[in-house]
C-alpha cells in the first residue's frame, strides 16, 4: 500500500482581521494509526495550534467530525484573525508511539496573510499656539495594518500639502505596522476656521480612505491691532475715547486703562463680535472728566492677550485746547461697546 | 453543557482495589483524551495516566504503571479508573479530567485505612 | 520526567498588592503546553491560562502568564479577595505529564 502523504491543498490563504480563516489538510491513508496536529512554523520553535486529542484549543474548530473511523478530512478554521495569526500553518500526522507520539509526514503548509485595517489617524499639532507666519508641526498617526503597503497625504481645506515626512514601522517583516507622518503648515491670519486633514488609504478600506482631522483654532493665535480715538464731545467738560481692539484670536483677553499711567480701569472682553474669518473684534469706552486735569492727559490702553506680554496704544488728551475730536476718525467694523464713567 | 460526574466515595482495605467511574455528557466522548489526576490530602496535584476513548489506547505514569487499569464504556460514556494493591498513600481526591484540561469532575474520595 | 518546580511555596500579601509566581521546568518545554491553575479549598482546580499567555474564558485581565523554555511565571496585577488560593502550573509537553507543587497566595 501506498505510503501516507498529507496534502495542504492551498499555499497561501488570505484573511481579513475579525474573520474565520479556513487551512484545509487531506490524509491519503489510515495508516499508520495516530493523531494529526496543526502547528504554526518549523522546527523546535514551532507553536502548537490544535491537537485533536488533547489541550486547549477555543478558537479552532474541525471542519469534518475526526472521530469518524474512516475520516481523512483534518481540516480546521480558526476564528477571529488577527494579524498576530499571520505565518505558516503545517499539518502533522503522527503515529503512536511510547511514551509519546512520533511525527510521521508533515504537509507542505499553508501561508496564512492578514489584511487588518488601519486604525482612524490621529492628527495632533504643537503644544503651544503660534502666530501667523509662523511654520508649525503636526503629526498623524496610524495603527495595526497589514500588509505594509499604506498611502498617506496631508490636506490644509482641500488643499494638498507637500512639505511632510513619513515613517512606516517596523522596516522588516511584522504582523502588523505603523505610520508616523510629520507635516509643516505656514500659519495666516485667516487659518482660524482651517483645518488640518491627515488621508490614509489602504487596500482593506475599499477606496474608502480614514481621515484624521486637526482644527487650527486650537493652535493659532492672532494678536490684537489696537486703535485709540477721541470721540466727539458728549459735554462740556467730557471726552470720550475708544480703544477698538480688532482681528484677535482666542478670545481670551484683558484691557486696561491707564491715565498719566496709573491704572483706572481693568476688564475681561466679554461681548465680543466675530468677524467671518474667525477672529473677534471688541471696543473699550473711557468717558474722561476734562475738568478735573489741569496738564494734558496720556491715555493708554493696554491689551494683555492670550496670556503674552502687554501691547498697547497711546491717545494724548490736550486740556488746554478746547475739547474737539481728535485723533483717527476710522470706523470700527463690527464693534462691540463697554462704556465707563471716570470722575 | 459540559458533564463530569463521578462515583461516590469510597473506603477501602490496604490490597484492596478501588474503581471509579466518571460519566461524560455534554460532548463527543471521543473526541478527546480522559486524564485522570489525583491529590492527596493537603498535598499538589499527580497525573496518573489518560485514555484514549477512540480506541482505549492508555498512557500511565510510570509510578503508576503496575497498579492502575484505565478504560471507558462508549456505549455509556463512562470512563474507569482502577487503582489496585491500595496503600495508605493512595488516599486521595480522584479527578477525571477531559482532555481539554478545561472540565474537571468533582472529585472522589478514596480513603485507605485498616 | 519534566520536574516543574514552583516558587515561593506560599505567597503572604494584602488585597491590591501585585503577586508573581514562578514556575520552572527542569528541561525546556514548548509554551504552547504551559498551563496554569488555581484550586480554592474543596473545589476541583480551574483553567486560569493555556499555553503560557492566553487566559481562559471567565478569567479577569488582572491575571497574565507569560515566559518561555524554562522559566514561566503567572503574574496578577491586583489582589482581589477572591485570588486567595492555590495556584498550580502543569505541561503536556511530554509524558508523563506533570504539575507543580504549587504556590499558596495566601492574605498577609
Known amino acids: 500500500e501506498e505510503e501516507l502523504q498529507v496534502i495542504q491543498p492551498d499555499k497561501s490563504v488570505l484573511v481579513a482581521a475579525g474573520e474565520t480563516a479556513t487551512l484545509r489538510c487531506t490524509a491519503t491513508s489510515l495508516i499508520p494509526v495516530g493523531p494529526i496536529q496543526w502547528f504554526r512554523g518549523a522546527g523546535p520553535g514551532r507553536e502548537l495550534i490544535y491537537n485533536q486529542k488533547e489541550g486547549h484549543f477555543p478558537r479552532v474548530t474541525t471542519v469534518s467530525d475526526l472521530t469518524k473511523r474512516n475520516n481523512m478530512d483534518f481540516s480546521i478554521r480558526i476564528g477571529n484573525i488577527t494579524p498576530a495569526d499571520a505565518g505558516t500553518y503545517y499539518c502533522v500526522k503522527f503515529r503512536k508511539g511510547s511514551p509519546d507520539d512520533v511525527e510521521f509526514k508533515s504537509g507542505a503548509g499553508t501561508e496564512l496573510s492578514v489584511r487588518a485595517k488601519p486604525s482612524a489617524p490621529v492628527v495632533s499639532g504643537p503644544a503651544a499656539r503660534a502666530t501667523p507666519q509662523h511654520t508649525v508641526s503636526f503629526t498623524c498617526e496610524s495603527h495595526g495594518f497589514s500588509p505594509r503597503d499604506i498611502t498617506l497625504k496631508w490636506f490644509k481645506n482641500g488643499n494638498e500639502l507637500s512639505d511632510f515626512q513619513t515613517n512606516v514601522d517596523p522596516v522588516g517583516e511584522s504582523v502588523s505596522y505603523s505610520i508616523h507622518s510629520t507635516a509643516k503648515v505656514v500659519l495666516t491670519r485667516e487659518d482660524v476656521h482651517s483645518q488640518v486633514i491627515c488621508e490614509v488609504a489602504h487596500v482593506t478600506l475599499q477606496g474608502d480612505p480614514l481621515r484624521g482631522t486637526a482644527n487650527l483654532s486650537e493652535t493659532i493665535r492672532v494678536p490684537p491691532t489696537l486703535e485709540v480715538t477721541q470721540q466727539p464731545v458728549r459735554a462740556e467738560n467730557q471726552v470720550n475715547v475708544t480703544c477698538q481692539v480688532r482681528k484677535f484670536y482666542p478670545q481670551r483677553l484683558q484691557l486696561t486703562w491707564l491715565e498719566n499711567g496709573n491704572v483706572s480701569r481693568t476688564e475681561t472682553a466679554s461681548t465680543v463680535t466675530e468677524n467671518k474669518d474667525g477672529t473677534y473684534n471688541w471696543m473699550s469706552w473711557l468717558l474722561v472728566n476734562v475738568s478735573a486735569h489741569r496738564d494734558d492727559v496720556k491715555l493708554t490702553c493696554q491689551v494683555e492677550h492670550d496670556g503674552q506680554p502687554a501691547v498697547s496704544k497711546s491717545h494724548d488728551l490736550k486740556v488746554s485746547a478746547h475739547p474737539k475730536e481728535q485723533g483717527s476718525n476710522t470706523a470700527a467694523e463690527n464693534t462691540g461697546s463697554n462704556e465707563r464713567n471716570i470722575y | 453543557q459540559v458533564q463530569l460526574v463521578q462515583s461516590g466515595a469510597e473506603v477501602k482495605k490496604p490490597g484492596a482495589s478501588v474503581k471509579v467511574s466518571c460519566k461524560a455528557s455534554?460532548?463527543?466522548?471521543?473526541?478527546?483524551?480522559m486524564h485522570w489526576v489525583r491529590q492527596a490530602p493537603g498535598q499538589g496535584l499527580e497525573w496518573m495516566g489518560r485514555?484514549?476513548?477512540?480506541?482505549?489506547?492508555?498512557k500511565y505514569n510510570p509510578k503508576f504503571q503496575d497498579r492502575v487499569t484505565m478504560t471507558v464504556d462508549t456505549s455509556t460514556n463512562t470512563a474507569y479508573m482502577e487503582l489496585s494493591s491500595l496503600r495508605s498513600e493512595d488516599t486521595a481526591v480522584y479527578y477525571c479530567?477531559?482532555?481539554?484540561?478545561?472540565?474537571w469532575g468533582q472529585g472522589t474520595t478514596v480513603t485507605v485505612s485498616s | 520526567e519534566i520536574v516543574l518546580t514552583q516558587s515561593p511555596g506560599t505567597l503572604s500579601l494584602s488585597p491590591g498588592e501585585r503577586a508573581t509566581l514562578s514556575c520552572r521546568a527542569s528541561?525546556?518545554?514548548?509554551?504552547?503546553?504551559l498551563y496554569w491553575y488555581q484550586q480554592k479549598p474543596g473545589q476541583a482546580p480551574r483553567l486560569l491560562i493555556y499555553?503560557?499567555?492566553n487566559l481562559a474564558s471567565g478569567i479577569p485581565d488582572r491575571f497574565s502568564g507569560s515566559g518561555s523554555g524554562t522559566d514561566f511565571t503567572l503574574t496578577i496585577s491586583r489582589l482581589e479577595p477572591e485570588d486567595f488560593a492555590v495556584y498550580y502550573c502543569?505541561?503536556?509537553?511530554?509524558?508523563?505529564?506533570?504539575f507543580g507543587g504549587g504556590t499558596k497566595v495566601e492574605i498577609k
Open positions: 455534554g460532548f463527543n466522548f471521543e473526541d478527546t483524551y
Open positions: 485514555i484514549d476513548p477512540a480506541d482505549g489506547d492508555t
Open positions: 502543569h505541561q503536556w509537553y511530554s509524558y508523563p505529564r506533570t
Open positions: 479530567v477531559r482532555g481539554n484540561y478545561v472540565n
Open positions: 499555553s503560557t499567555s
Open positions: 528541561s525546556s518545554v514548548s509554551s504552547s503546553y
